[in-house]
């Protein structure tokens, strides 16, 4: 099943202490999916979309960006025929960067 879209939700972090908000959206025909957020292959958070909605927002507290590993990806799962769980492809990566200090 098709990959979700992924994007940073404003406000964008300006330091490692700022929270990070990441939205993941499934295609329109997959509402109520279960979403998993990964960083560098490690599970960061799981969220389920409401039954009438196709997206979630992961809210990560400040300092989450300090964790080692690669960029963020997300993936969703839905129940298919015979109640078998089907997983989507991984989303494109999203990188979190901070402005270079001016001092």
């Amino acid at each position: 099943i098709p990959a979700p879209s992924i994007r940073l939700v404003p406000p964008y972090p300006s330091s490692q202490e700022d929270p990070i908000h990441i939205a993941c959206m499934a295609p329109g025909n997959f509402p109520g999916a279960n979403f998993t957020l990964y960083r560098g292959g490690q599970v960061v958070q799981l969220l389920q979309a409401p039954t009438d909605q196709r997206g979630v927002t992961f809210n990560l507290s400040g300092g989450s960006s300090k964790a080692p590993g690669g960029p963020f990806h997300c993936q969703y799962g839905v129940l298919g025929e015979l109640n078998q769980s089907q997983l989507s492809d991984l989303s494109e990566p999203v990188n979190v960067s901070f402005p270079v200090p001016t001092w």
Epitope: P10, P11, D18, P19, A23, A49, G55, V56, N59, S61
Partner: antibody, heavy 122, light 110 residues
Framework: QVTLKESGPALVTPTQNLTLTCTVS??????????WGWIRQPPGKGLEWIGS???????YYNPSLKSRVTISVDTSKNQFSLKLSSVTAADTAVYYC??????????????WGQGTLVTVSS | QSVLTQPPSVSGAPRQRVTISCSGS????????VNWYQHPPGKAPKLLIY???LLPSGVSDRFSGSKSGTSASLAISGLQSEDEADYYC???????????FGTGTKLTVL
């Protein structure tokens, strides 16, 4: 049911500082799903976003007001506050506090206070 | 000066349909989702539409939103007298790094 209520002076003298407080009831200000913001409406004009704060203290401000604005949060009292320095008559407005919810892949202001009219005059 | 432009006023007779436009640029509407708020006189603003076209629970399905490119629209069908209010589009502007509201549109039900 979440409610927000603004409190503070109705009249402020030019060049003074304005401080308003928003008290949140029926929900925790410390949730990771919300920002808490201030929006104003000068008489006969439209809505203008002033700035917002996260429970952790992270803030972001309207660039046109940034040099005069400070927003702070007191999680123990479930309150957040706006300080606007060196006010002028142009700061006369109805000031609203509001909750910004992060949900469903985006965000929106879902709960608003009733607003408080602040007049800047000598 | 707002970076989102709306018509100052629109009007319609009861049971008619009206639309309110909101014009922006790539840094706001073009790259970000749009919300719509209803602001009745003397009351607090109320969320009407979020994420371009989604309806919050409790809001009448007479209201609908759409977006194309750097413009968004709010449609109100079956106009009622209680719809009289100011309406604002809103989104995020990546250039300003902040929330922006439209100039506002006053709806009059004739």
């Amino acid at each position: 049911q979440v409610t927000l209520k603004e409190s503070g002076p109705a009249l402020v003298t030019p060049t003074q500082n304005l401080t308003l407080t928003c008290t949140v009831s029926g929900g925790s200000i410390s949730s990771s799903s919300y920002y808490w913001g201030w929006i104003r409406q000068p008489p006969g004009k439209g809505l203008e976003w002033i700035g917002s704060i996260y429970y952790s203290g992270s803030t972001y401000y309207n660039p046109s007001l940034k040099s005069r604005v400070t927003i702070s949060v007191d999680t123990s009292k479930n309150q957040f506050s706006l300080k606007l320095s060196s006010v002028t008559a142009a700061d006369t407005a109805v000031y609203y506090c509001a909750r910004r919810r992060n949900s469903s892949g985006w965000f929106y202001f879902d709960y608003w206070g009733q607003g408080t009219l602040v007049t800047v005059s000598s | 000066q707002s970076v989102l432009t709306q018509p100052p006023s629109v009007s319609g007779a009861p049971r008619q349909r009206v639309t309110i436009s909101c014009s922006g640029s790539r840094s706001n509407i073009g790259d970000n989702a749009v919300n719509w708020y209803q602001h009745p006189p003397g009351k607090a603003p109320k969320l009407l539409i979020y994420y371009d076209d989604l309806l919050p629970s409790g809001v009448s399905d007479r209201f609908s939103g759409s977006k194309s490119g750097t413009s968004a629209s709010l449609a109100i069908s079956g106009l009622q007298s209680e719809d009289e209010a100011d309406y604002y589009c809103a989104t995020w502007d990546d250039s300003l790094n902040g929330h922006v509201f439209g100039t506002g549109t006053k709806l009059t039900v004739l």
